[in-house]
Structure formats: C-alpha cells, structure tokens
C-alpha cells in the first residue's frame, strides 16, 4: 500500500493546500491570534516536509477548507458576564466553579485509578503469556526479538515498569545480559505509548477533537518508533548505551537509597487496592522459567503473611544430598533429610472485591478490563465536558496563552525545553508516563494544548519515567542494584538520545508531522485509528516475533523484501512530491496501482458494510445516553443528540455543513460557531452549563 492514501487525483497545485509550500509561516497559526507563535517559528518548510500533515484523502473528498484544522478552536463564553451578575448570581457562580473543580478532580482521580485497574486487568489477561515471552532463549542473540518482546509484554501488561522490573530481575539473576536487555527496554518504551492512544480513541465522537487528540497521542508513538528505528541499529553496532551506562555504574559507589517516593499512588492505591491486588512476582517467576509459578494465580489472596524459619523434613535424590549422614533417613522408598525451610504462614486476607470469588485470572481480567474501560471512557467524557464548560472566554485565553506561548525573543527556543522539564516533573509526580500522557490527550483534543506544545511535554514525560526508574533502582537491594541501575540508565540515555534526534532542530520534528498526517487520516476514516493500533502494537511485533522464532534466515528472507518495498515506496513518494518530472508519467502518481492499494476509500466501504448492522443499536444507545446526560446537566432540548446517527451526519455533509460526529459532550456554542451561526446566548437555550 502506498504510504499516504488518496494520492490519486490529488490537486494539481500543491501550493494551494500545502502549509508553507511557498512562504515561511508559523507552525500553528491561530486565526484568533490568541496564541503567539510556538517555539522555533519562522522555519522554512518545504512541500515535502509538511506533506504528511494533510491526508490527501481529505482534499479529494471534502471541499478545501480555508481554516487550518490544526488551529485551536475558539472557545466562546456563552455565559453571563461577571459584571452583569447580581450578588446571588455571583455566589451561585462561585459555588458552581467550586463544584466543577471538585467534580473535575473527582473524575480525574477515577480516571487515574481506572488506568491503574486497566493495567492490572491487562496483566491478568496477558501477564502469564507475557512472562513466557521472556523465557525465550533467542532474546540473547536477536535484538529484534528483544525489541518486539519488549513491545508485546508492555502492551499485554499495560505497564512498562512491570516489564522493566522483569528484565531487571532476569539480568540480576544472570538469565539475561545487559546487552540483550537494552532492546527489550526500547520495546517497553514503545509499548507504554499505547495507553494514551487508547485514551485518544475515547474522543472518537468529534472529528476535529479526535484529529487533535489522536495526533497528540500518536506523537508519542512516532517518537518512540523513530527513536528505535535509528538507535537500535546504532546500539547493535556500537553498544554505546551499554558502554556509557557501565562506565557510570562503575564510577560511582552507590549505597542503597530509600524507596522512590510514591506520590500519586498514595492517593490512588487505597481505592485501587479495594478493587484488585496482584502478585507481580508471578510474572517475573514465569519469565525466569519457574514451573511452579505457571499454576499460581496473579490475584493476591493473602496480604498479611508471616515468614518463619523452621526445620522441615524434605526428600532428597540421594544420600549425597543429605545435610549430614545422621540427619538422613528413609521411609522405605524415598530418602529424607532435615533442612531449614522458610515457610509462609497466611495471616490476613486482602480486602479487594475478588478475594473470595476464586475466579480464574482470565475471568477477573476480562471483568476488570470491561469495567476499567467503561470508567475510563466515562471519566474522560465528563472531564472533557467539565473542561469544555470551564475553559471558555477569558479563562481559555489565559490558559491557552500560558501553555502555548513562547518566551520573548531571543529566548523563544527555550520554551520547548522548559516544556520537557515540566513534562518530566509532572511525570515524576504522578510516577507514570501513561497517566501523564493520558491526561494530556483530552486537553489536546479540546484544544487547550497544541500538538507542538504537547510534543515536548511528552518527551519530558519519557524522561520523567526514567528518573523514577533510576530512583527505584537506587532503592533496590544490593543484589539487583547494579543491574537495575544500569538498565534504568540505559532507558534514560535512550530517551535523551531520542530527544537529541527528534527535537532540537525543528526540521527533525518528524513525529509531529507524522502524527498530524495520521490524525487527518483517522479523523476521516475513524476505523483506521484502531487499524493503526492493531498493526503497530500487535501485528508487526507478533509477526517479527514469529519470524524471529523461525530463525535468522526466515526473518531476513521475509524482512529484506518488505524493507526494500517500504524504501522503494518512500523514495518514489519523495520523487513524486519533490521532482515528479524525473519519473515516467505513469509513476508520477499512484493511479497505476489498484485503488485499494493507494486509497482507503474502498477499504472504508468494506468496513462500513461490516459495521453497518451495529451502527443502529449504537446510535440508539448514544441517543439515550446523550439525553440522560443532557437531563443530568440541565441542558435543554438544543442538545443535538440526533446527530449521533451516521445518516444524519451524511446528510449534513451533503449540505456542506462541517461534520461533527457522535458526541455526548457537545458545547452548543462551539457547534454553532463551527456552522457560522454564533449568536447571543438565550437563557433558554444555553447548553454550556454543566
């Protein structure tokens, strides 16, 4: 398939639709001038560089928009001005504000808790299988296999810290070398970026919102994939991460520190441990080929245990294994001896929901997966709804200016680096890059943060999660201190290297352009988002895993032609956009290929055929939910629940109305503004109140 869909019949004059094709302009121009230019403005951008930003699919099937879809929306304040309110109204407004803040914090709390439970659910569903990935002996010799194992395990357990801690324990017990562990860490870095991509899917209702949210989430994915694409071969060739980290570890005489501070967990743990508690050691034991662990449940039953040392009678293979001849005897069949054995006495059961159900791990995992996704989705909807009602007018202007504005000249370039530090700091506070980037995603979606600003925040988040790992490593026991510290440092320097590759020079900020390109495609064909997720996080890693197991000859035999085709397509794409005259007429576009190979339109038709029967019940459900939501929020009938249906959406599209797809948390003012019919709010029809 050609890299960018709908290339055939593309507009003949690219300069009409390509940002910066002929002129220099800021990366995120804002028609309302609410935001100043972002960092590194006035950058010469060629046609080729920004081409992925716009799906040419949009160009063919939709009229060319004058507005840049990546501009932040103007959030109009449709409420009564403060000065116009009476005393009662002001008090009411203050209480409303406090109420919204409390609700926002509450939903944010449950959002973070649901992410934690989601991780537990994934571990219950796929944890044991993930553990078994590690017990593959080929990891040692095949860095590519290590990489995909890192991706798959982290995707299955939804926690890079779990996969990293397995790697640490394997290195500490000499089952894995640091060299073999580095690709796994790189893979874990990729795998952890799936969480905020899943969160972005929750905003699929509103096309423009989804475009921004999905691009904002996948900028993390692309950064990680591109970093690995460059740094894995470099590491395999030079072992620079291994060497540098080894020098650091050896040059310091570390003493065991205190435990890394649990900051956010202090608040969330009391709640999440009432839902489920897991015995994370089981996955590690499976990874370390412990046969007994395979039959153990991941669900923790006993939380309070007493470990006691006692002399116990145990069987031994022969008299040679006896502690001493006088402490050996037989029962007639087996030889017994007395050994000091530590045994665990169960004292108190855990206090979570599943402690007395004795359900299989898979069942508990599926239950928690469904519940956590529902809570995650619900919380996200409510967070966006509350933010939508709060972030209007002056508030929005102040926030957007604060977040997206650069420092004054000549320090504008420093803004991005400050954002990296903020991202690292925030991640250190919440102790999880997944939580931070997932919280960032809806903010990008509703237009509070630009993708250009979200990018350094995300990069900072990557750094933040490694500093947490370094602290955790310093707190680890003596036997694992060296290995855990070296691995944490490898993780840290890998992310630093990635930032140096894909951030300092604006031209190299490929992840932003790639994410925007994907955002455009996914906004038009929303199924493509799921397709992307499955392909990048499951199919490709599983295929590489399977081919790696088959051996190097098979991997090379399949991989080389695939890589060759990709390079060929990219070169052709480059020539088509830069100097098409060099190419024969036939190769100047992709029309020589069947439509399904260079356009998503035929695929869309096929998928629509399959998903069609499910759309009607979905639509009804959406309408009911929306109506209930409107009633709860005190919105009048102006809430456009009817737009849930695709047929209505298509009807609007036919009339040339910019489409807003199924959404349960619409702001009527924004909707009207989008249709160019913003008018003074009528007290009867005001829908912005929560």
């Amino acid at each position: 398939m050609a890299p960018w869909p709908e290339l055939g019949d593309a507009q003949p004059n690219p300069s009409k639709y390509l940002e910066g094709a002929t002129s220099q302009q800021p990366i995120t121009p804002d028609k309302s001038k609410e935001t100043n230019k972002t960092d590194n403005t006035e950058v010469p951008v060629t046609k080729f560089e920004l081409l992925p930003t716009y799906s040419t699919a949009t160009l063919i099937e939709e009229p060319t928009e004058v507005d840049d879809p990546w501009n932040l929306p103007t959030l109009q304040d449709s409420g009564i001005k403060w000065s116009e309110r009476d005393a009662k109204g002001k008090i009411l407004c203050v209480f409303q504000g406090i109420g919204r803040l409390i609700l926002l914090l509450g939903f944010l709390y449950f959002f973070v808790c649901s992410l934690d439970v989601l991780s537990s659910a994934f571990q219950l569903v796929g944890g044991k299988m993930a553990g078994q990935f590690f017990s593959n002996s080929s990891i040692m010799s095949n860095p590519l296999l290590g990489l995909v194992i890192g991706v798959l395990v982290t995707v299955f357990v939804q926690s890079s810290s779990t996969s990293t801690s397995i790697v640490v324990s394997m290195v500490a017990s000499s089952l894995l070398t640091v060299r073999a562990a580095i690709p796994i860490i790189m893979g874990a870095n990729i795998g952890t970026s799936i969480t905020n991509t899943i969160v972005a899917l929750m905003q699929v209702g509103d096309r423009s919102e989804f475009r921004r949210a999905f691009a904002g989430a996948t900028v993390h994915d692309f950064f990680n994939w591109l970093s690995v694409l460059v740094l894995l071969p470099v590491e395999v060739a030079t072992h620079y991460l291994e060497v540098v980290t080894q020098l650091i570890v050896e040059s310091f005489h570390f003493k065991n520190g205190e435990d890394a501070p649990d900051l956010l967990k202090v608040i969330t743990k009391p709640f999440t441990k009432l839902i489920v508690q897991l015995d994370k050691k089981v996955i590690s034991q499976i990874a370390m080929n412990d046969e007994t662990a395979k039959n153990k449940s991941l669900v923790k039953i006993w939380c309070k245990t007493f470990t006691n040392m006692t002399q116990m009678n145990v069987t031994v293979p022969s008299m040679a294994n006896c502690t001493s001849p006088s402490l050996c005897w037989t029962d007639g069949i087996q030889i017994w001896t007395m050994k000091n054995v530590t045994y665990k006495e169960n004292i108190a059961k855990c206090q979570h929901i599943f402690v007395n159900f004795h359900l299989p791990d898979l069942a508990v995992g599926i239950i928690l997966l469904i519940i956590s996704l529902l809570v995650l989705c619900g919380c996200l909807i409510m967070i966006v709804k509350i933010l939508g009602s709060v972030l209007k007018g002056q508030v929005a202007t102040v926030i957007k200016k604060t977040i997206n504005t650069d420092f004054p000249f000549p320090f504008a370039w420093l803004t991005g680096y400050l954002a990296i530090l903020v991202g690292a700091g925030m991640t250190f506070i919440v102790q999880s890059s997944s939580v931070f980037t997932s919280a960032l995603t809806p903010l990008i979606g509703i237009g509070v943060i630009t993708i250009e600003r979200a990018y350094p925040l995300t990069l900072g988040s990557n750094i933040g999660t490694t500093t947490t790992a370094i602290l955790a490593a310093l707190a680890s026991p003596g036997n694992t201190l060296r290995s855990s510290l070296q691995i944490a440092l490898c993780h840290f320097f890998f992310n630093i290297s990635g930032i140096l590759l894909w951030y300092p020079i604006p031209f190299t900020r490929l992840p932003i352009r790639m994410a925007k390109g994907l955002g455009n495609i996914s906004a038009k064909y929303r199924w493509f988002a799921i397709f992307y997720l499955i392909i990048f996080f499951f199919l490709i890693p599983l295929t590489v895993f399977g081919l790696s197991l088959a051996g190097w000859p098979v991997l090379v035999g399949v991989g080389v032609p695939v890589v060759f085709i990709i390079i060929l397509v990219l070169c052709l794409r480059l020539l088509q956009s830069r100097c098409p005259r060099v190419l024969p007429k036939k190769l100047q576009n992709w029309n020589f290929l069947p439509l399904c190979m260079h356009s998503l339109k035929p695929w869309d038709a096929v998928i629509s055929k399959f998903t069609g029967p499910f759309q009607m019940p979905c639509c009804c459900c959406c309408r009911v939910c929306c109506r209930v939501c409107c009633l709860l929020c005190g919105c009048p009938k102006c809430c456009r629940c009817s737009k849930c249906c695709q047929d209505l959406e298509e009807g609007q599209e036919a009339q040339g109305v910019p489409v807003k797809a199924p959404e349960t948390f619409d702001n009527i003012t924004i909707s009207r503004e989008a249709q160019g019919e913003v008018r003074a709010p009528d007290s009867k029809t005001e829908c912005t109140a929560l």
């Epitope: 006088s326 005897w329 037989t330 029962d331 007639g332 069949i333 087996q334 030889i335 017994w336």
Partner: antibody, heavy 119, light 107 residues
Framework: QVQLQQPGAELVKPGASVKMSCKTS????????MHWVKQTPGQGLEWIGA????????AYNQKFKGKATLTADKSSSTAYMQLSSLTSEASAVYYC????????????WGQGTSVIVSS | DIVMTQSHKFMSRSVGDRVRITCKAS??????VAWYQQKPGQSPKLLIY???TRHSGVPDRFTGSGSGTDFIFTISNVQSEDLADYFC?????????FGAGTKLELK
C-alpha cells in the same frame, strides 16, 4: 480406625507363585507407604520392600528382588505382594504394614498371611 | 546393610521391675530407630519412633533413648501384659533392618 486385613493362610506348591492381598480401610490409601515384612522363627523380621500407592513407586530389599513384586490398586485400597518360584524357604508369615508419613517406622500392621510351601 | 544387634535374646523380670533392652547399630543411624512389641500369636505393634518419641496410645512407662549407634528401650514398671518380644528397627537407609528381638519373660 486404621485396619489392614490379610488372608490367614496360603498353601502353595514349590515353584508356584502366590499373590497375597492387604485390604486397607480407615485412612487415605494413597498417602502412606505400604511395607511388606517376612517373619520366620529362625530369621526374625525381614523387610521385603515397600510401595507408595499414590504413584506406584516401589523399593525392594536386594535379597527379595525378582522374588517379590509389589502392586497397589487405588480403587479398592488394596496392596498386593506376589511371590514367585516358591521354595520351602519362603514358608513364613508375611505382614503388610503401613509406613508413617515421612519416615520408615510402621505404625499399623496386618494380621499376617501364613504361607506354607509344600508339595 | 546396617545390622541391628540386640545383645539379649531373653530377659527375665518380675512385675514392677525396670527393664532396659539395648540395640546396637553397625553404623551411625542418627535417631532413625523404632521399637516394636510383638505378643505371641499377634502382629508387631509400634511403641517408639525417632528413638525417643512414643506412638499414640502407648503408656508412658515405655521410653526410648540413644542416638548414633547405641539405643536403649526401657520399661520402667513392668506389667504382666508386657510379656512379649521387643524388636528394634533402623530406617536410616534401605534396606530397613530389624534386630533379632529380645523376649521379655516373667520370673
């Protein structure tokens, strides 16, 4: 209570074989070893071997290897000992005895089967 | 094979007396020794295991002592029902072996 029942006597011809039983009750048959002991007036008590009914694992006294075969039927909680190629020296009382878990002391004994080898 | 030697084939005691039956192992058996009582026409009955531990239901006049190679079985207050053969047995290693037995008779 734990009981081990053995048939009183067996009269066999020289060169023939005999299969004696030991039916157990009052405990979980598969958890303890079952020992077989031979008693003759001249030789005293001699350990023949043991079987672990749970897995069918056996151990024999070298002196009785090839002579005695121990088996166990979990469904009927019965242990068996087959003695082959009998000679007059095999005439004795044969006891089955339950082994205590984890060591070789025998806490419950059957009444014994008296085997008389005579033509 | 470990040989268990009971030096006295017969021992004669009056009711109320104290009797000490000895048993010597040909090599160190730790404490893996059991003592049995066999009354005429009956099967053996376990009295002591681990050289010193009384089996359930065994009167406390029966005691065992010793470790390594030398073991002693004591009946502190002989009763008429104690007339029987007494065997020691080692279970330190296979094959399990018994002593020849000591017959306790009443004077």
């Amino acid at each position: 209570q734990v009981q081990l029942q053995q048939p009183g006597a067996e009269l066999v011809k020289p060169g023939a074989s005999v299969k004696m039983s030991c039916k157990t009750s009052g405990y979980t048959f598969t958890t303890n070893n079952m020992h077989w002991v031979k008693q003759t007036p001249g030789q005293g008590l001699e350990w023949i071997g043991a079987i672990y009914p749970g897995s069918g694992a056996t151990a024999y006294n070298q002196k009785f290897k090839g002579k005695a075969t121990l088996t166990a039927d979990k469904s009927s909680s019965t242990a068996y000992m087959q003695l082959s190629s009998l000679t007059s020296e095999a005439s004795a009382v044969y006891y089955c005895a339950r082994g205590m878990y984890g060591h070789g002391a025998m806490d419950y004994w059957g009444q014994g089967t008296s085997v008389i080898v005579s033509s | 094979d470990i040989v268990m030697t009971q030096s006295h084939k017969f021992m004669s005691r009056s009711v109320g007396d104290r009797v000490r039956i000895t048993c010597k192992a040909s090599q160190d058996v730790g404490t893996a020794v059991a003592w049995y009582q066999q009354k005429p026409g009956q099967s053996p009955k376990l009295l002591i295991y681990w050289a010193t531990t009384r089996h359930s239901g065994v009167p406390d006049r029966f005691t065992g002592s010793g470790s390594g190679t030398d073991f002693i079985f004591t009946i502190s207050n002989v009763q008429s029902e104690d007339l029987a053969d007494y065997f020691c047995q080692q279970y330190s290693s296979n094959p399990l072996t018994f002593g020849a037995g000591t017959k306790l008779e009443l004077k």
